[in-house]
Interface confidence: medium
């Protein structure tokens, strides 16, 4: 903390302005006042003070502000956010999208740092729910932020707000959040037409169940084998070579380079060999001919 | 673009006083975004800042503090540059001087640079 | 005083090496990093500031990383006019100072 000093005549600061970044730090202590610089706080940004100057700032607003920054001082933060701890962030109550993109922009270029996390956190949950132009800020800010959230925190993503997201905010989801992104996304885009549809859907495939997959394959999209390799295999096992064929079109060459990879390797393990000899493709692995095929599934449910 | 021209004598007696001149082009003594200071480079001590000078509604100033007692940078607004002036110098003060644009504390532009050394 | 131990103290590499140099300092200064670089007889050029931010006029080739105590100044491929030596300085505290300089050297 810093001490106690009586400010140097003639050093008393009228304003914020440049003259303060010849302030040691025992005269801005002394000099500036904390409810002048809470009202001139947006002009703190376009002067190049030192971090230890930066310190004994944010030491008078925490003063004059002991339960938490109003939002008028927040929007103006600048980098002074940088200077804050989660526990600064948890006393605030952020409503205003401004304010958010605001903070957003000085932490711009650097990973989610812990302050960030809490701010949005306080943020959204304040909303009450991801609505859709506060999901267009943070993917812009944070393309992988949508994957960072648990399935029960996506839940709360409204359907309208899934217009915003981007392939590459995908990038990293597990099934488990594609799970409950996908039918959020199949019903944003459900009055598209068959090509726009699939274009819109196609990243958010990793949660299609297969009676979706079979829809598709009787669209002429032509997925992908990226896509294909990102499917659910549990959704991909029952579809067969015939559907397989139609959904990936002139792409159906690439089983080949994937067949020792899931979810192909399983798929053409359930598959009859003389089925998978239409392809073409030399895929090996398939059930000989003559054998049986039972469907266990059925009995292990009943079991 | 921003240059810095110094002049100074190059030897100096010890318990005398240093005194070197930068002078500005392509921007301001006056300007109130930078400020203006003088750093020194010795094999001994490697590259050490003096002190700086800028104008915020009035002139101001701020010295290091191993110089702090010895020190006075002053500018010359009618010949738009600054001066260096140490006193009572020893041979611990022969050094190259640099005078240097500051943004922040962030040198963007030097002077080329004078040797003074302080011998008798 | 904030100190500012910068390592190697000096290096041998050939043109087109990536080149990697290191600045730590004594106490947590944020990103208020500078990096300089100087030739023989030349004053010192303003490379990057902030840590990371590349001063206008500056070679892509030239980055810098790092937050807190440890940065890091790399050189992705070294250049014919790159042998020079390369100096941290840290203005988180009011009373600024610099590394001991790291020299790099034609192998």
């Known amino acids: 903390e810093v001490e106690k000093t009586a400010c140097p005549s003639g050093k008393k600061a009228r304003e914020i302005d440049e003259s303060l970044i010849f302030y040691k730090k025992w005269e801005l202590e002394a000099c500036v006042d904390a409810a002048l610089l809470a009202t001139q706080m947006d002009r703190v940004n376009a002067i190049p003070f030192t971090y230890e100057q930066l310190d004994v700032l944010k030491h008078k607003l925490d003063e004059l502000y002991p339960q938490g920054y109003p939002e008028s001082v927040i929007q103006h933060l600048g980098y002074l956010f940088l200077k804050m701890s989660p526990e600064d962030i948890r006393k605030w109550n952020v409503t205003s999208l401004e304010t958010l993109k605001a903070l957003l922009e000085v932490n711009k270029g650097h990973e989610m740092s812990p302050q960030v996390a809490t701010l949005i956190d306080r943020f959204v949950k304040g909303r009450g729910q991801l609505d859709k132009d506060t999901l267009d800020t943070l993917t812009a800010f944070y393309p992988g932020y949508l994957c960072s959230l648990s399935p029960e925190e996506l839940s709360s993503v409204p359907p309208s707000s899934i217009w915003a997201v981007r392939p590459q905010d995908l990038d990293t989801c597990d099934p488990r959040q594609l799970d409950v992104l996908y039918p959020k996304a199949r019903l944003a885009f459900q009055n598209m037409n068959g090509s726009e549809y699939f274009v819109k859907i196609q990243s958010f495939l990793g949660g299609a169940p297969t009676e979706d997959l079979k829809a598709l394959s009787q669209q002429n999209v032509s997925m992908d084998l990226a896509t294909f390799m990102k499917l659910r295999t549990d959704a991909v096992l029952p579809l067969t070579v015939a559907e397989v064929q139609k959904l990936l079109g002139p792409h159906v060459e690439g089983l080949k380079a994937e067949e020792r990879h899931r979810p192909v390797r399983d798929w053409i393990l359930r598959q009859r060999q003389d089925d998978l000899d239409t392809l073409g493709l030399g895929l090996q692995g398939g059930i000989p001919n003559g054998y049986l095929v039972l469907d266990l599934s059925m009995q292990e449910a009943l079991s | 673009q921003v240059q810095l021209q110094q002049s100074g004598p190059g030897l100096v007696k010890p318990s005398q006083t240093l005194s070197l001149t930068c002078a500005i082009s392509?921007?301001?003594?006056?300007?109130?975004?930078?400020?203006w200071g003088w750093i020194r480079q010795s094999p001994g001590r490697g590259l050490e800042w003096l002190g700086r000078i800028g104008y915020r509604s009035k002139w101001m100033n701020d010295y290091a503090v191993s110089v702090k007692s010895r020190i006075t940078i002053n500018p010359d607004t009618s010949k738009n540059q600054f001066s260096l002036q140490l006193n009572s110098v020893t041979p611990e003060d022969t050094a190259v001087y640099y005078c240097?644009?500051?943004?922040?504390?962030?040198?963007?532009?030097w002077g080329q640079g004078t040797l003074v050394t302080v011998s008798s | 005083d904030i100190q500012m131990t910068q390592s190697p103290s000096s290096l041998s590499a050939s043109v087109g090496d990536r080149v990697t140099i290191t600045c730590r300092a004594s106490?947590?200064?944020?990103?208020?990093l500078a990096w300089y670089q100087q030739k023989p007889g030349k004053a010192p050029k303003l490379l990057i500031y902030g840590a990371s931010t590349l001063q206008s006029g500056v070679p892509s080739r030239f980055s810098g990383s790092g937050s807190g105590t440890d940065f890091t100044l790399t050189i992705s491929s070294l250049q014919p006019e790159d042998f020079a030596t390369y100096y941290c300085?840290?203005?988180?505290?009011?009373?600024?100072?610099f590394g001991q300089g790291t020299k790099v050297e034609i192998k």
């Open positions: 392509g921007d301001s003594v006056s300007s109130r975004s930078a400020a």
């Open positions: 240097a644009r500051m943004q922040g504390f962030q040198l963007d532009y």
């Open positions: 300085q840290q203005y988180y505290s009011y009373s600024v100072t």
């Open positions: 106490q947590t200064i944020s990103s208020a």
